[in-house]
Amino acid sequence: FNISGCSTKKLLWTYSTRSEEEFVLFCDLPEPQKSHFCHRNRLSPKQVPEHLPFMGSNDLSDVQWYQQPSNGDPLEDIRKSYPHIIQDKCTLHFLTPGVNNSGSYICRPKMIKSPYDVACCVKMILEVKPQTNASCEYSASHKQDLLLGSTGSISCPSLSCQSDAQSPAVTWYKNGKLLSVERSNRIVVDEVYDYHQGTYVCDYTQSDTVSSWTVRAVVQVRTIVGDTKLKPDILDPVEDTLEVELGKPLTISCKARFGFERVFNPVIKWYIKDSDLEWEVSVPEAKSIKSTLKDEIIERNIILEKVTQRDLRRKFVCFVQNSIGNTTQSVQLKEKR
């Protein structure tokens, strides 16, 4: 199709080489078309348009994305050629940064239902650059945490070194939805709820004498509970003796509950005590069996191919540790009579 009639938008993604970050493009179809495809309606009830050319569908995924190759080749369907780019409803997600993402991206409705639809498309010219200026040492992260139940804030990474006074007007989105009243480089969250978790996008306009473009950054916001003040507790084994059959295989499971920590480095291991000697056993990797907002239950098993007489004289000790402290639980094997 002819893309010369598409509205054009220029965007800049300046990515940090020291952190993982994502990027998004919205299919900003002209109003009122957008509302029929993306359910991101911003019309007031009084702004009813003269004609509604895009009555075709209310399916949220009813837009098609293409990339325009720089060599003039035909448009390429994003889904077929770019595995690191994912389409979600009317949003294009770039999972990895890199200058190779620079280029022209075009979106338009899949279903063309009227003569007006032909020109209903948006061309986004994306320029991707690594961050060069080290002048701002403490720029906000692309991953930000909000503590549940307290007051918090979400900062726009590309503007976090500027004071509120000198900051340009910012446009914020949460999970693709415009937050029309948020215009500063920092959103204050009076009281944090689970609701506040999500993908936030902040845009501002930059211009020189020739043209203007939108500078965009994406922030993944996670809602968390406060760091635990407790050391982990061992849920299993509970008993300190275990009846076993000699010559049979045996698996002893150690399950421990670790409270939430922002920097989480749980330790769960088995070691064996035999008279004055003790040594760590090489056992299968630990695995998380339950994870909630407040805590995580991690399990690690020790496997004996067959129980020997010698094993009855040993103590099998599960050791668990977090930043607060450690807990142990020992098990003595006893022959079944």
């Epitope: 009243v181 009076d190 009281e191």
Partner: antibody, heavy 117, light 111 residues
């Protein structure tokens, strides 16, 4: 309960401060203390809210910015300062303790402000 | 600011009848909408919050529905005591749960 005070008959161009006093509770996190007005025979009109928690954030209807100022003055009082009053500001002014999306809603009986020459 | 448009301005129904009031938001407010009942000389009384959750003590004849930009309040099995003015209110402002813009109101007359 909540009680508004400070309503009066004033001349156009005058300023007035309304006070909302809480009894039986003190303002705390989770609550927004708000002012809403209602002109005689008309609908409810949101003016402003202040968050009672640590951020102390204030929120205004776009038409109220500049002329109206909401403040939490103590743990049991909130004020609304109004300047350059006109006849269009004649209304009953309600104070409310509220939080969106919850069952927490408490309103005062209202105080009448009349602006007339 | 969000603009809340409420229809109709007035409705008259007999006792035992059903009234439907609509409220349209100028932008997506998810389910952050409350409905209030107000009688002359009194402050408003909360009926419904989060678009469809009944406030305590409110009879189940009151039903709220909708999300995004379109919301409805339905009053079934009308009683004389339901004669009042009803208002919708948006209860989110940016990312904060701040009660703000009201609809213009609907006067319900019970015949």
């Amino acid at each position: 309960s909540l009680e508004e005070s400070g309503g009066d008959l004033v001349k156009p161009g005058a300023s007035l401060t309304l006070t909302c006093t809480a009894s039986g509770f003190s303002f705390s996190s989770s609550y927004y203390m708000c002012w809403v007005r209602q002109a005689p025979g008309k609908g409810l009109e949101w003016i402003a809210c202040v968050y009672a928690g640590s951020s102390g954030s204030t929120y205004y209807a776009s038409w109220a910015k500049g002329r109206f100022t909401i403040s939490k003055t103590s743990s049991t009082t909130v004020t609304l300062q109004m300047t350059s009053l006109t006849a269009a500001d004649t209304a009953t002014y309600f104070c409310a303790r509220d939080r969106g999306g919850t069952d927490i809603s408490l309103w005062g009986p209202g105080t009448l402000v009349t602006v007339s020459s | 600011d969000v603009v809340m448009t409420q229809t109709p301005a007035s409705v008259s129904e007999p006792v035992g009848g059903t009234v439907t009031i609509k409220c349209q938001a100028s932008e997506d407010i998810e389910s952050f909408l409350a409905w209030y009942q107000q009688k002359p000389g009194q402050p408003p009384k909360l009926l419904i919050y989060s678009a469809s959750t009944l406030a305590s003590g409110v009879p189940s004849r009151f039903k709220g529905s909708g999300s995004g930009t379109q919301f409805t309040l339905t009053i079934g099995d009308l009683e004389c005591a339901d004669a009042a003015t009803y208002f919708c209110q948006c209860t989110i402002y940016g990312v904060n749960f701040v009660p703000n813009a009201f609809g213009g109101g609907t006067e319900v007359v019970v015949k």
